[in-house]
């Protein structure tokens, strides 16, 4: 067990041109707060997937009113650290999302309004117990500077907070094979001993004597690969007799969601859908009012002036859930026409149109030939979102500006000589050949060797030669 700590140093305009406008004004004073979401591993998970390592909300910063005419400075920040406790081992690699929120303090109906100013995300490697790591992230024109670290809660120590420290039994040194616990030199490592025989590759323990299996392994010592072939369901019957179990209890066994939350399994963990009035990874945060800012992603909080009356989050387009915590995949409806690429920017949908199409949904087929001139008597032909020129004889290229050499492709067969001509080309055939391209041999009796009629057709019938 341990705590991930995040210290925000500054939030303000980034370097370079296009400084953002201040988020607050004399008419609309505001204050900032931050939300951090942690997930294990280096996964490129969507912003709305559960914060499986934990999440935290900062306090509100000081109220800020923009000075008229002044550029947006670094904005005043909340005091203190954001702390995300973790119960299990520190994973070493993690993904983070840090959101900067603005609370508008004007005369809002139903209390203050929240909107998301910036969201930064990243993936990092971090050993627990190490020094503060400094970071700078940019989101649009904003820049966020922060530091973070992971520290173990006693008696846990080590880079993953899985080793335990105990006070020394003897004043001078630790027992055989046990090292002093840096930085607690007066304590000794007490290694966490898993069940004897527990697979070092596929098993682990969080309590002495146990052997918990990584996903895909089962058995008393986590040595048996999970086979779903004989299972009744993907996790198999809940029985010790089958070899089908995903090892250990399922993530939703015993329902980890508090306060009437419903649990659904995810590939790595679980997700709680919380009833109104509760939120958090396990719906453990209760007595929430609008003053606590429970609506994420710019949701508007209404009601809930006291802990006993529920609040309601009115979600902006693109978000849903009782706390507006889930992003709607609006691109799945394929709103962009004519092969346009859909981009969900959160606050809006954008369609990136293919050449030849335009409009918010790429619905307009541009006149490909408008303003396009084909030189040297060529004519413009529309099609497929691009224009092309059909060039007059003797000319080629995209706009018919290049003089074509009709003989360049050696069109005359059987050694015929090619001559460029104003109307195209002329082939002077070698002896024994005839035709526009010298393609037919001439027989001694003077008949040309045209292809024979296919079986079943009499000479003279209409034919198509292949």
């Amino acid at each position: 067990a341990g705590v991930f700590e995040l210290q925000i140093h500054s939030f303000g305009p980034g370097p370079g041109p296009g400084a953002p406008r201040s988020p607050c004004s004399a008419r609309l004073p505001c204050r900032l707060f931050f939300r951090v979401c942690l997930k294990p591993g280096l996964s490129e998970e969507a912003a709305e997937s559960p914060c499986a390592l934990g999440a935290a909300l900062s306090a509100r910063g000081p109220v800020y009113t923009e000075q008229p005419g002044a550029p947006a400075p670094d904005l005043p920040l909340p005091d203190g650290l954001l702390q995300v406790p973790f119960r299990d081992a520190w994973p070493g690699t993690f993904s983070f999302i840090i959101e900067t929120w603005r609370e508008e303090l004007g005369d809002q109906i139903g209390g203050p309004a929240w909107s998301l100013l910036a969201r930064v995300a990243g993936r990092r490697r971090l050993a627990a117990g190490g020094p503060w790591a400094r970071d700078i992230q940019r989101a649009g024109a904003w820049e966020l500077r922060f530091s973070y670290r992971a520290r173990c809660e006693p008696p846990a120590v080590g880079t993953a907070c899985t080793r335990l420290c105990r006070p020394r039994s003897a004043p001078s040194r630790c027992g055989p094979g046990l090292r002093p616990c840096a930085p607690l030199e007066d304590e000794c490592e007490a290694p966490l001993v898993c069940r004897a025989g527990c697979s070092p590759e596929h098993g682990f323990c969080e309590q002495p004597g146990e052997c918990r299996c990584l996903e895909g392994w089962t058995g008393p010592l986590c040595t048996v690969p999970v086979s779903t072939s004989s299972c009744l369901s993907p996790r198999g019957p809940s029985s010790a007799t089958t070899g089908c179990l995903v090892p250990g209890p399922g993530p939703c066994d015993g329902n980890p969601c508090a306060n009437g939350g419903s649990c659904s399994e995810t590939p790595r963990s679980f997700e709680c859908t919380c009833p109104r009035g509760f939120y958090g990874l396990r719906c453990e945060v209760s007595g929430v009012t609008c003053a606590d800012g429970p609506c994420f992603n710019g949701g508007l909080c209404v009601g809930g002036a006291d802990p006993d009356s529920a609040y309601i989050c009115h979600c902006p387009p693109g978000f849903q859930g009782s706390n507006c915590e889930k992003r709607v995949d609006r691109c799945s409806l394929q709103p962009c026409r004519n092969g346009g690429l859909c981009l969900d920017l959160g606050h809006a949908l954008r369609c990136r149109c293919r050449a030849g199409f335009a409009g918010p949904r790429c619905e307009h087929d541009l006149d490909d030939c408008a303003g396009r001139a084909c030189a040297n008597g060529g004519t413009c032909v529309e099609g497929g979102g691009a224009h092309r020129c059909s060039c007059a004889l003797g000319f080629g290229g995209r706009d018919c500006r290049e003089r074509a050499d009709p003989c360049a492709a050696r069109p005359c067969a059987h050694g015929g000589r090619c001559y460029a001509h104003f109307s195209g080309l002329v082939c002077a055939c070698a002896p024994g050949y005839m035709g526009a391209r010298c393609e037919f041999p001439v027989h001694p009796d003077g008949a040309s060797a045209l292809p024979a009629a296919p079986p079943g057709l009499r000479p003279g019938d209409p034919q198509r030669y292949l």
Epitope: A196, P220, V224
Partner: antibody, heavy 119, light 107 residues
Framework: QVQLQQSGGDLMKPGASVKISCKAA????????IEWVKQRPGHGLEWIGE????????TYNEKFKGKASFTADTSSNTAYMQLSSLTSEDSAVYYC????????????WGQGTLVTVSA | DIVMTQSQKFMSTSVGDRVSVTCKAS??????VAWYQQKPGQSPKALIY???YRYSGVPDRFTGSGSGTDFTLTISNVQSEDLAEYFC?????????FGAGTKLELK
């Protein structure tokens, strides 16, 4: 040294329940699985299931689900197995055993408890 | 469930002999096999773990071998106190299962 002391034998009526105890000494009780094994003459040894006293985590042999249930009291270093709805098929010697510290398997065994079910 | 088959219910031997008790698993259990000795009226005693390692205090005339599905307990220079029933056990899969036992008796 490690010791497992089991409760004495019992003569039980069909349909009744019995609770067998296994008191551990000489080691950290919470940190090692206690295993329960049934032995009937001519039937060899049958594994009933196990409990890790520190966490209360249990695993049962499907065959004994509904018949056996395990508990552990870390304050008295005692593990318990309750057998319910007894029939003559439950007449047997029941052993508790402890999983090894560095070596897997059951290096330590209790002396056994004879349960006899008879009308 | 994994079935541990001890094909010989009884084996006859003499003091000083070398005897091998066999056990066959119905599917691969790696080396997650233990051997136990039980004398009448006593609790089982652990002899071998991980197919071939002796528990502490077990005389070195007891040796275990095998992996996968075929396992053997060999007693070299049999002593009179070795006359007992021997059980194999797999602890690779739940439920843990034992063989039916092989009784070692004097010729």
């Amino acid at each position: 040294q490690v010791q497992l002391q089991q409760s004495g034998g019992d003569l039980m009526k069909p349909g009744a329940s019995v609770k067998i105890s296994c008191k551990a000494a000489g080691y950290t009780f919470s940190n090692y699985y206690i295993e329960w094994v049934k032995q009937r003459p001519g039937h060899g040894l049958e594994w009933i299931g196990e409990i890790l006293p520190g966490s209360g985590s249990t695993t049962y042999n499907e065959k004994f689900k509904g018949k056996a249930s395990f508990t552990a009291d870390t304050s008295s270093n005692t593990a318990y197995m309750q057998l319910s709805s007894l029939t003559s098929e439950d007449s047997a010697v029941y052993y508790c055993a402890r999983w090894g510290a560095r070596e897997p398997g059951f290096p330590y065994w209790g002396q056994g408890t004879l349960v006899t079910v008879s009308a | 469930d994994i079935v541990m088959t001890q094909s010989q219910k009884f084996m006859s031997t003499s003091v000083g002999d070398r005897v091998s008790v066999t056990c066959k698993a119905s599917q691969n259990v790696g080396t997650n096999v233990a051997w136990y000795q039980q004398k009448p009226g006593q609790s089982p005693k652990a002899l071998i773990y991980s197919a071939s390692y002796r528990y502490s205090g077990v005389p070195d005339r007891f040796t275990g071998s095998g992996s996968g599905t075929d396992f053997t307990l060999t007693i070299s220079n049999v002593q009179s106190e070795d006359l007992a029933e021997y059980f194999c056990q797999q602890y690779n899969n739940y439920p843990l299962t034992f063989g039916a036992g092989t009784k070692l008796e004097l010729k």
